[in-house]
Interface confidence: low
Protein backbone atom coordinates (compact mmCIF):
# COMPACT_ATOMS: atom_id res chain seq x y z
CA UNK A 1 0.00 0.00 0.00
CA UNK A 2 1.03 3.58 -0.17
CA UNK A 3 0.66 6.13 2.54
CA UNK A 4 -0.50 9.11 0.54
CA UNK A 5 -0.72 11.54 3.40
CA UNK A 6 0.62 14.83 2.15
CA UNK A 7 2.72 16.94 4.45
CA UNK A 8 4.35 20.26 3.85
CA UNK A 9 8.07 20.60 4.36
CA UNK A 10 10.29 23.49 3.45
CA UNK A 11 13.63 22.64 2.02
CA UNK A 12 15.52 24.86 4.44
CA UNK A 13 14.64 22.67 7.39
CA UNK A 14 15.81 19.37 6.07
CA UNK A 15 19.27 18.02 5.78
CA UNK A 16 20.74 15.97 2.95
CA UNK A 17 21.09 12.26 3.49
CA UNK A 18 24.14 10.61 1.95
CA UNK A 19 23.60 8.69 -1.25
CA UNK A 20 24.20 4.97 -1.45
CA UNK A 21 27.93 4.33 -1.94
CA UNK A 22 27.35 3.13 -5.48
CA UNK A 23 25.64 6.35 -6.43
CA UNK A 24 27.77 8.91 -8.18
CA UNK A 25 25.59 11.89 -7.38
CA UNK A 26 27.16 14.48 -5.14
CA UNK A 27 25.00 15.95 -2.45
CA UNK A 28 24.95 19.65 -1.81
CA UNK A 29 26.77 20.13 -5.05
CA UNK A 30 26.82 23.87 -5.68
CA UNK A 31 28.16 25.95 -8.47
CA UNK A 32 28.46 29.70 -8.52
CA UNK A 33 26.03 31.20 -10.96
CA UNK A 34 26.91 34.88 -10.49
CA UNK A 35 29.50 37.19 -12.03
CA UNK A 36 31.81 39.09 -9.69
CA UNK A 37 33.49 42.49 -9.70
CA UNK A 38 36.53 43.20 -7.65
CA UNK A 39 35.61 45.72 -5.01
CA UNK A 40 39.07 46.78 -3.86
CA UNK A 41 38.59 50.54 -3.29
CA UNK A 42 35.27 50.03 -1.61
CA UNK A 43 35.43 47.04 0.65
CA UNK A 44 38.70 45.29 0.84
CA UNK A 45 37.26 42.30 2.72
CA UNK A 46 34.73 41.13 0.18
CA UNK A 47 33.95 40.95 -3.49
CA UNK A 48 30.84 42.73 -4.65
CA UNK A 49 28.55 40.60 -6.73
CA UNK A 50 26.67 41.91 -9.70
CA UNK A 51 23.16 40.51 -9.74
CA UNK A 52 22.38 37.50 -7.58
CA UNK A 53 24.55 34.59 -6.72
CA UNK A 54 22.50 31.51 -7.48
CA UNK A 55 23.88 28.32 -6.05
CA UNK A 56 22.55 25.12 -7.56
CA UNK A 57 21.79 22.67 -4.81
CA UNK A 58 21.28 18.94 -5.21
CA UNK A 59 20.18 17.14 -2.09
CA UNK A 60 18.14 14.30 -0.74
CA UNK A 61 15.27 15.20 1.54
CA UNK A 62 14.64 13.21 4.68
CA UNK A 63 12.15 13.38 7.51
CA UNK A 64 14.46 11.26 9.61
CA UNK A 65 13.51 7.78 8.49
CA UNK A 66 12.06 8.25 5.04
CA UNK A 67 14.29 9.57 2.26
CA UNK A 68 13.51 11.03 -1.13
CA UNK A 69 13.68 8.58 -3.98
CA UNK A 70 15.60 11.00 -6.19
CA UNK A 71 17.60 14.08 -5.29
CA UNK A 72 15.92 17.46 -5.30
CA UNK A 73 17.45 20.20 -7.42
CA UNK A 74 16.85 23.80 -6.44
CA UNK A 75 18.45 27.23 -6.27
CA UNK A 76 19.90 28.65 -3.10
CA UNK A 77 19.91 32.44 -3.07
CA UNK A 78 22.91 33.64 -1.10
CA UNK A 79 24.98 36.65 -0.19
CA UNK A 80 25.03 40.32 -1.00
CA UNK A 81 24.37 41.71 -4.43
CA UNK A 82 23.86 44.82 -6.48
CA UNK A 83 20.54 45.39 -8.21
CA UNK A 84 21.10 45.26 -11.94
CA UNK A 85 19.59 48.73 -12.66
CA UNK A 86 22.44 50.46 -10.80
CA UNK A 87 25.19 48.72 -12.70
CA UNK A 88 25.92 51.45 -15.21
CA UNK A 89 26.39 53.92 -12.33
CA UNK A 90 28.46 51.40 -10.48
CA UNK A 91 30.73 50.87 -13.42
CA UNK A 92 31.01 54.63 -13.81
CA UNK A 93 32.02 54.84 -10.17
CA UNK A 94 29.39 57.40 -9.13
CA UNK A 95 26.41 55.73 -7.46
CA UNK A 96 28.37 52.77 -6.28
CA UNK A 97 30.59 54.66 -3.90
CA UNK A 98 27.61 56.40 -2.36
CA UNK A 99 25.73 53.10 -2.07
CA UNK A 100 28.52 51.29 -0.32
CA UNK A 101 29.14 54.15 2.07
CA UNK A 102 25.58 53.64 3.40
CA UNK A 103 25.94 49.91 3.97
CA UNK A 104 25.73 50.25 7.73
CA UNK A 105 22.00 51.00 7.62
CA UNK A 106 20.85 49.12 4.54
CA UNK A 107 22.13 46.50 2.17
CA UNK A 108 21.07 44.51 -0.84
CA UNK A 109 20.65 40.81 -0.25
CA UNK A 110 20.07 37.99 -2.68
CA UNK A 111 16.74 36.45 -1.65
CA UNK A 112 14.19 33.98 -2.97
CA UNK A 113 12.10 35.41 -5.75
CA UNK A 114 10.12 32.63 -7.40
CA UNK A 115 9.17 29.36 -5.81
CA UNK A 116 7.05 26.45 -6.86
CA UNK A 117 5.46 23.70 -4.85
CA UNK A 118 6.32 20.22 -5.91
CA UNK A 119 5.41 16.83 -4.57
CA UNK A 120 8.22 14.50 -3.69
CA UNK A 121 8.01 10.89 -2.66
CA UNK A 122 9.95 9.68 0.32
CA UNK A 123 10.55 6.00 0.76
CA UNK A 124 10.42 4.52 4.21
CA UNK A 125 12.06 1.65 6.01
CA UNK A 126 9.04 -0.56 5.92
CA UNK A 127 8.44 -0.22 2.21
CA UNK A 128 5.73 2.43 2.28
CA UNK A 129 6.09 5.70 0.46
CA UNK A 130 5.14 9.05 1.90
CA UNK A 131 4.31 12.08 -0.21
CA UNK A 132 5.48 15.53 0.85
CA UNK A 133 4.97 18.97 -0.57
CA UNK A 134 8.16 20.96 -0.83
CA UNK A 135 8.62 24.59 -1.82
CA UNK A 136 11.47 24.80 -4.27
CA UNK A 137 13.21 28.06 -5.13
CA UNK A 138 13.36 28.62 -8.89
CA UNK A 139 14.66 32.22 -9.09
CA UNK A 140 16.49 34.74 -6.95
CA UNK A 141 16.27 38.53 -6.73
CA UNK A 142 18.24 41.36 -5.25
CA UNK A 143 16.31 42.98 -2.39
CA UNK A 144 17.14 45.97 -0.24
CA UNK A 145 17.20 45.24 3.48
CA UNK A 146 17.38 47.63 6.37
CA UNK A 147 18.64 46.50 9.74
CA UNK A 148 15.10 46.00 10.95
CA UNK A 149 14.37 43.37 8.29
CA UNK A 150 14.02 39.90 9.59
CA UNK A 151 14.63 37.22 7.01
CA UNK A 152 11.90 34.75 7.90
CA UNK A 153 10.31 34.27 4.53
CA UNK A 154 9.32 30.66 5.23
CA UNK A 155 6.68 29.54 7.66
CA UNK A 156 6.36 25.89 8.48
CA UNK A 157 2.88 24.63 7.98
CA UNK A 158 2.03 21.00 8.57
CA UNK A 159 -1.15 19.40 7.38
CA UNK A 160 -0.53 16.07 9.01
CA UNK A 161 0.44 14.85 12.45
CA UNK A 162 4.11 14.70 11.50
CA UNK A 163 6.49 16.96 13.35
CA UNK A 164 8.43 19.43 11.24
CA UNK A 165 11.48 17.89 9.64
CA UNK A 166 14.57 18.68 11.62
CA UNK A 167 18.30 18.57 11.18
CA UNK A 168 19.59 15.15 12.02
CA UNK A 169 22.73 13.13 11.86
CA UNK A 170 23.60 11.70 8.53
CA UNK A 171 23.26 7.96 8.50
CA UNK A 172 24.09 5.06 6.29
CA UNK A 173 21.47 3.67 4.00
CA UNK A 174 21.52 -0.03 3.58
CA UNK A 175 20.17 -0.10 0.08
CA UNK A 176 19.88 1.95 -3.02
CA UNK A 177 16.93 4.28 -3.20
CA UNK A 178 14.33 3.27 -5.71
CA UNK A 179 10.61 2.91 -6.13
CA UNK A 180 10.03 1.00 -2.93
CA UNK A 181 11.95 1.13 0.24
CA UNK A 182 12.70 -1.97 2.11
CA UNK A 183 11.65 -3.61 5.33
Amino acid sequence: FKNDATEILYSHVVKPVPAHPSSNSTLNQARNGGRHFSSTGLDRNSRVQVGCRELRSTKYISDGQCTSISPLKELVCAGECLPLPVLPNWIGGGYGTKYWSRRSSQEWRCVNDKTRTQRIQLQCQDGSTRTYKITVVTACKCKRYTRQHNESSHNFESVSPAKPAQHHRERKRASKSSKHSLS
Partner: antibody
Protein backbone atom coordinates in the same frame (compact mmCIF):
# COMPACT_ATOMS: atom_id res chain seq x y z
CA UNK B 1 23.90 -4.55 22.93
CA UNK B 2 20.52 -3.94 21.32
CA UNK B 3 17.47 -4.85 23.39
CA UNK B 4 13.74 -4.46 22.93
CA UNK B 5 11.95 -5.18 26.19
CA UNK B 6 8.16 -5.46 26.16
CA UNK B 7 5.59 -5.20 28.92
CA UNK B 8 4.07 -8.30 30.48
CA UNK B 9 1.07 -10.44 29.50
CA UNK B 10 -2.42 -8.96 29.56
CA UNK B 11 -5.80 -10.56 30.16
CA UNK B 12 -8.65 -8.42 28.88
CA UNK B 13 -12.38 -8.62 28.21
CA UNK B 14 -13.93 -7.92 24.82
CA UNK B 15 -14.50 -4.20 24.32
CA UNK B 16 -11.66 -3.16 26.61
CA UNK B 17 -8.43 -1.41 25.63
CA UNK B 18 -4.86 -2.64 26.01
CA UNK B 19 -1.61 -0.71 25.70
CA UNK B 20 1.65 -2.60 25.24
CA UNK B 21 5.05 -0.97 25.69
CA UNK B 22 8.38 -1.70 24.05
CA UNK B 23 11.47 -0.15 25.62
CA UNK B 24 14.51 0.09 23.37
CA UNK B 25 18.12 0.24 24.49
CA UNK B 26 21.57 -0.10 22.98
CA UNK B 27 20.94 2.17 19.99
CA UNK B 28 19.68 5.63 19.11
CA UNK B 29 15.92 5.24 19.39
CA UNK B 30 14.98 7.90 16.84
CA UNK B 31 17.26 6.49 14.14
CA UNK B 32 15.26 3.33 13.41
CA UNK B 33 11.58 2.87 12.71
CA UNK B 34 9.73 0.46 14.98
CA UNK B 35 7.40 -2.15 13.50
CA UNK B 36 4.85 -4.37 15.19
CA UNK B 37 4.16 -8.00 14.31
CA UNK B 38 1.20 -10.11 15.45
CA UNK B 39 1.29 -13.86 16.01
CA UNK B 40 -1.99 -15.55 16.87
CA UNK B 41 -1.69 -18.82 18.86
CA UNK B 42 -0.28 -21.57 16.66
CA UNK B 43 -0.37 -19.23 13.67
CA UNK B 44 2.05 -17.38 11.46
CA UNK B 45 3.41 -13.86 11.66
CA UNK B 46 1.57 -10.79 10.45
CA UNK B 47 3.18 -7.40 9.99
CA UNK B 48 0.95 -4.69 11.48
CA UNK B 49 2.78 -1.58 10.36
CA UNK B 50 5.39 0.74 11.79
CA UNK B 51 5.99 4.09 13.40
CA UNK B 52 8.61 6.57 12.33
CA UNK B 53 10.37 7.21 15.64
CA UNK B 54 11.84 10.44 14.32
CA UNK B 55 8.65 12.16 13.18
CA UNK B 56 6.11 10.12 15.14
CA UNK B 57 4.13 9.28 12.02
CA UNK B 58 2.51 5.81 12.10
CA UNK B 59 1.74 3.67 9.05
CA UNK B 60 -0.73 0.79 9.42
CA UNK B 61 -1.18 -2.33 7.33
CA UNK B 62 -4.68 -2.59 5.88
CA UNK B 63 -5.86 -5.19 8.40
CA UNK B 64 -4.81 -2.98 11.31
CA UNK B 65 -6.41 0.32 10.43
CA UNK B 66 -8.97 1.62 12.88
CA UNK B 67 -8.67 0.06 16.31
CA UNK B 68 -4.88 -0.03 16.45
CA UNK B 69 -2.62 2.88 17.39
CA UNK B 70 1.16 3.17 17.49
CA UNK B 71 2.67 5.89 19.67
CA UNK B 72 5.98 6.92 21.22
CA UNK B 73 7.52 8.28 24.35
CA UNK B 74 10.80 9.35 22.78
CA UNK B 75 12.37 10.59 26.01
CA UNK B 76 11.97 7.08 27.42
CA UNK B 77 12.97 5.34 24.15
CA UNK B 78 9.65 3.54 24.27
CA UNK B 79 7.14 2.60 21.59
CA UNK B 80 3.54 1.67 22.35
CA UNK B 81 0.86 -0.39 20.70
CA UNK B 82 -2.70 0.33 21.79
CA UNK B 83 -5.63 -1.85 20.74
CA UNK B 84 -9.09 -0.43 21.33
CA UNK B 85 -12.42 -2.26 21.52
CA UNK B 86 -10.70 -5.62 21.90
CA UNK B 87 -12.13 -8.65 20.11
CA UNK B 88 -11.50 -12.36 20.65
CA UNK B 89 -9.46 -12.50 17.45
CA UNK B 90 -6.99 -10.01 18.93
CA UNK B 91 -5.75 -12.79 21.21
CA UNK B 92 -2.14 -13.10 20.13
CA UNK B 93 1.47 -12.41 20.96
CA UNK B 94 2.56 -8.98 19.75
CA UNK B 95 6.21 -8.30 18.94
CA UNK B 96 7.93 -4.97 18.52
CA UNK B 97 10.71 -5.32 15.98
CA UNK B 98 13.54 -3.33 14.46
CA UNK B 99 15.53 -3.77 11.29
CA UNK B 100 19.20 -4.53 11.05
CA UNK B 101 19.93 -1.30 9.26
CA UNK B 102 18.38 2.08 8.60
CA UNK B 103 16.54 0.70 5.60
CA UNK B 104 15.85 -2.79 6.71
CA UNK B 105 16.20 -4.67 3.47
CA UNK B 106 18.35 -6.96 5.52
CA UNK B 107 15.42 -8.39 7.39
CA UNK B 108 14.11 -7.95 10.93
CA UNK B 109 17.13 -8.52 13.10
CA UNK B 110 15.85 -7.41 16.48
CA UNK B 111 12.68 -8.64 18.16
CA UNK B 112 11.12 -7.91 21.52
CA UNK B 113 10.31 -10.96 23.65
CA UNK B 114 6.63 -10.59 22.76
CA UNK B 115 3.58 -9.67 24.80
CA UNK B 116 0.72 -12.13 25.02
CA UNK B 117 -2.68 -10.45 24.99
CA UNK B 118 -5.57 -12.74 25.85
CA UNK B 119 -9.10 -11.52 25.18
CA UNK B 120 -11.74 -13.54 26.93
CA UNK B 121 -15.14 -12.89 28.43
CA UNK C 1 -0.47 -8.60 -0.81
CA UNK C 2 2.28 -11.02 -1.76
CA UNK C 3 1.41 -14.54 -0.60
CA UNK C 4 4.30 -16.66 0.64
CA UNK C 5 3.72 -20.42 0.39
CA UNK C 6 6.02 -22.73 2.32
CA UNK C 7 6.41 -26.47 1.81
CA UNK C 8 6.35 -28.74 3.61
CA UNK C 9 4.39 -27.49 6.60
CA UNK C 10 5.99 -30.21 8.71
CA UNK C 11 9.44 -31.72 8.22
CA UNK C 12 10.41 -34.72 10.39
CA UNK C 13 14.20 -35.12 10.51
CA UNK C 14 16.89 -37.13 12.22
CA UNK C 15 19.86 -35.33 13.72
CA UNK C 16 22.64 -35.10 11.14
CA UNK C 17 20.21 -35.18 8.20
CA UNK C 18 20.09 -32.57 5.48
CA UNK C 19 16.84 -30.61 5.54
CA UNK C 20 15.36 -28.49 2.79
CA UNK C 21 12.46 -26.02 2.98
CA UNK C 22 10.85 -24.40 -0.02
CA UNK C 23 9.23 -20.97 -0.18
CA UNK C 24 7.30 -19.69 -3.17
CA UNK C 25 5.98 -16.14 -3.60
CA UNK C 26 2.89 -15.13 -5.54
CA UNK C 27 4.92 -12.56 -7.46
CA UNK C 28 8.58 -11.95 -8.19
CA UNK C 29 10.60 -10.68 -5.27
CA UNK C 30 13.27 -9.12 -7.43
CA UNK C 31 13.30 -5.44 -6.67
CA UNK C 32 13.82 -2.82 -9.36
CA UNK C 33 17.22 -2.11 -7.80
CA UNK C 34 18.34 -5.69 -8.54
CA UNK C 35 18.13 -6.97 -4.97
CA UNK C 36 15.79 -9.70 -3.80
CA UNK C 37 14.43 -9.15 -0.32
CA UNK C 38 13.64 -12.68 0.82
CA UNK C 39 14.55 -13.60 4.39
CA UNK C 40 14.42 -16.68 6.62
CA UNK C 41 13.65 -16.80 10.35
CA UNK C 42 13.70 -19.55 12.96
CA UNK C 43 11.31 -19.50 15.91
CA UNK C 44 11.85 -21.91 18.75
CA UNK C 45 9.02 -22.74 21.17
CA UNK C 46 8.30 -19.87 23.55
CA UNK C 47 10.81 -17.57 21.86
CA UNK C 48 10.80 -14.71 19.40
CA UNK C 49 11.77 -15.43 15.80
CA UNK C 50 15.44 -14.99 14.94
CA UNK C 51 16.84 -13.81 11.64
CA UNK C 52 18.88 -16.52 9.90
CA UNK C 53 19.26 -15.49 6.28
CA UNK C 54 18.63 -12.14 4.67
CA UNK C 55 18.41 -11.20 1.00
CA UNK C 56 18.14 -14.83 -0.17
CA UNK C 57 21.59 -16.09 0.78
CA UNK C 58 23.31 -13.88 3.35
CA UNK C 59 23.78 -15.41 6.79
CA UNK C 60 23.05 -13.08 9.67
CA UNK C 61 25.83 -12.67 12.22
CA UNK C 62 26.31 -15.70 14.44
CA UNK C 63 24.36 -18.04 12.16
CA UNK C 64 26.27 -21.30 11.53
CA UNK C 65 27.40 -22.06 7.99
CA UNK C 66 25.29 -25.21 7.88
CA UNK C 67 22.43 -22.86 6.96
CA UNK C 68 22.32 -21.73 3.36
CA UNK C 69 19.74 -19.96 1.23
CA UNK C 70 19.25 -19.90 -2.52
CA UNK C 71 16.72 -19.04 -5.20
CA UNK C 72 15.51 -16.17 -7.31
CA UNK C 73 12.32 -14.63 -8.65
CA UNK C 74 9.53 -16.56 -6.96
CA UNK C 75 11.24 -19.79 -5.81
CA UNK C 76 13.52 -20.00 -2.80
CA UNK C 77 15.07 -22.71 -0.68
CA UNK C 78 16.58 -22.91 2.78
CA UNK C 79 18.95 -25.82 3.40
CA UNK C 80 20.37 -27.14 6.63
CA UNK C 81 23.31 -29.36 5.77
CA UNK C 82 23.39 -31.35 9.02
CA UNK C 83 20.50 -30.81 11.40
CA UNK C 84 21.40 -30.29 15.04
CA UNK C 85 19.09 -30.34 18.06
CA UNK C 86 19.19 -26.53 18.34
CA UNK C 87 17.84 -26.23 14.78
CA UNK C 88 14.45 -27.64 15.70
CA UNK C 89 11.59 -25.18 15.53
CA UNK C 90 9.43 -23.33 13.03
CA UNK C 91 11.05 -21.70 9.99
CA UNK C 92 9.40 -18.73 8.31
CA UNK C 93 10.25 -17.13 5.02
CA UNK C 94 9.41 -13.46 4.58
CA UNK C 95 9.57 -10.88 1.84
CA UNK C 96 10.14 -7.14 2.05
CA UNK C 97 10.30 -6.28 -1.63
CA UNK C 98 6.62 -5.38 -1.71
CA UNK C 99 4.44 -3.62 0.80
CA UNK C 100 3.16 -4.88 3.15
CA UNK C 101 5.86 -7.16 4.42
CA UNK C 102 4.51 -10.73 4.46
CA UNK C 103 5.50 -14.06 5.97
CA UNK C 104 5.02 -17.68 5.03
CA UNK C 105 2.85 -19.89 7.24
CA UNK C 106 5.93 -21.65 8.64
CA UNK C 107 7.58 -25.06 8.39
CA UNK C 108 7.92 -27.05 11.59
CA UNK C 109 11.19 -28.99 11.72
CA UNK C 110 10.88 -31.74 14.32
CA UNK C 111 12.49 -35.04 15.19
CA UNK C 112 11.15 -38.18 13.49
Amino acid sequence: QIHLVQSGPELKKPGETVKISCKASGFSFTTYGMSWVKQAPGKGLKWMGWINTYSGVPTYADDFKGRFAFSLETSASTAYLQINNLKNEDTATYFCVRGREYYYGSGIAFWGQGTLVTVSA
Amino acid sequence: DVVMTQTPLSLPVSLGDQASISCRSSQSLEHSNGNTYLHWYLQKPGQSPKLLIYKVSNRFSGVPDRFSGSGSGTDFTLKISRVEAEDLGVYFCSQSTHVPLTFGAGTKVELK
